[in-house]
């Protein structure tokens, strides 16, 4: 069946060095365990995280994200997931695309990550 993919609708904010969680879900909600779920970044559609065939597809992940991401899938049975990015870097800031693919049917949504410096307010003088 067909579905829509829905992102958070607002930018996700995280501090450098912290974790960021980017939620994504399908509507109407349904079991997405057997679907392909992923996040990529433009340009060049670099794979941030990919879950297919019931497991994380580590070999397809862009090197700069290797070991820093986790798919939170406690609610995948209801079509809800989130991407956790650990040890957030300034270079992680920007647009992400979340997608769900069921056989040949795919839909996606945009998610924005804003990365902030925890020390920006310190006056060096």
């Amino acid at each position: 069946g067909q579905f829509r993919v829905i992102g958070p609708g607002h930018p996700i904010r995280a501090l450098v060095g912290d974790e960021a969680e980017l939620p994504c879900r399908i509507s109407p909600g349904k079991n997405a365990t057997g679907m392909e779920v992923g996040w990529y970044r433009s340009p060049f559609s670099r794979v941030v995280h990919l879950y297919r065939n019931g497991k994380d597809q580590d070999a397809e992940q862009a090197p700069e994200y290797r070991g820093r991401t986790e798919l939170l899938k406690e609610s995948i049975g209801e079509g809800k997931v989130a991407l956790r990015i650990q040890n957030v870097r300034f270079s992680d800031e920007g647009g992400y695309t979340c997608f769900f693919r069921d056989h040949s049917y795919q839909e996606e949504a945009a998610v924005e990550l804003k990365v902030e410096d925890p020390f920006y307010w310190i006056n060096p003088g």
């Epitope: 057997g34 392909e36 297919r52 065939n53 497991k55 994380d56 597809q57 580590d58 070999a59 397809e60 056989h103 040949s104």
Partner: antibody
């Protein structure tokens, strides 16, 4: 070098269960999943399921749901596949194969030698 | 259900000739296709993954091509040890194997 050594041939009666073992060596067992594939006599290959050797999580082909159980013993680097309610059409060679998802792609880069399971009354 | 159809079922060639084996998917599998070789009494061996990438230790005479629904395994200048059964496998949506192509000596 990577090696997967399976248990020996089995003869079972219809309705019985069989448990095939697959002992891995030459790599870190819990870093790679294990898949199971079977091949009936003079037939092609059929995927049965997969086990995450680190967490013990499993995914089974729909055809085998409810009849197959895949487990592992990380302390001995051994994966197990148990098939219950055996029928004559389950007669096949059963292979374990290392899942190369972490390093190459979602494919099978090393295989066990196979275990022949014969189901006959 | 996603199915893979291999052709021909049997291919009879002589050493030094070129073998062309085909695998067609019932729907797109993108580039998520692998090829395996199986000799009698042995387990399958991974040859190609990602439709065109040779696995470690596989000779350059084996090459894969294609994407979407149509794929080809080409074996140039056949060696005696290449005569075997070849299976394609998709891993785009779980896992399916083709029925195999038997490459035999003419």
């Amino acid at each position: 070098q990577v090696q997967l050594v399976q248990s020996g041939a089995e003869v079972k009666k219809p309705g019985a269960s069989v448990k095939v073992s697959c002992k891995a060596s030459g790599y870190t067992f819990t870093s790679y999943g294990m898949q199971w594939v079977r091949q009936a006599p003079e037939q092609g290959l059929e995927w049965m399921g997969w086990i995450n050797t680190n967490t013990g999580g499993t995914s089974y082909a729909q055809k085998f749901q409810g009849r197959v159980t895949m487990t592992r013993d990380a302390s001995t680097s051994t994966a197990y596949m148990e098939l219950s309610s055996l029928r004559p059409e389950d007669t096949a060679v059963y292979y374990c194969a290392r899942d190369a998802t972490r390093i190459l792609a979602d494919v099978l880069d090393y295989w066990g030698q196979g275990t022949l399971v014969t189901v006959s009354s | 259900e996603l199915t893979l159809t291999q052709s021909p079922v049997t291919l009879s060639l002589s050493p030094k000739e070129t073998a062309t084996l085909s695998c067609r998917a019932s729907q797109s599998v993108r580039s998520y296709l692998a090829w395996y070789q199986q000799k009698p009494g042995q387990a399958p061996r991974l040859l190609i993954y990602g439709a065109s990438t040779r696995a470690t230790g596989i000779p350059a005479r084996f090459s894969g091509s294609g994407s979407g629904t149509d794929f080809t395994l080409t074996i140039s200048s056949l060696e005696p040890e290449d005569f075997a059964v070849y299976y394609c496998q998709q891993y785009s949506s779980w896992y399916t194997f083709g029925q195999g192509t038997k490459l035999e000596i003419k």
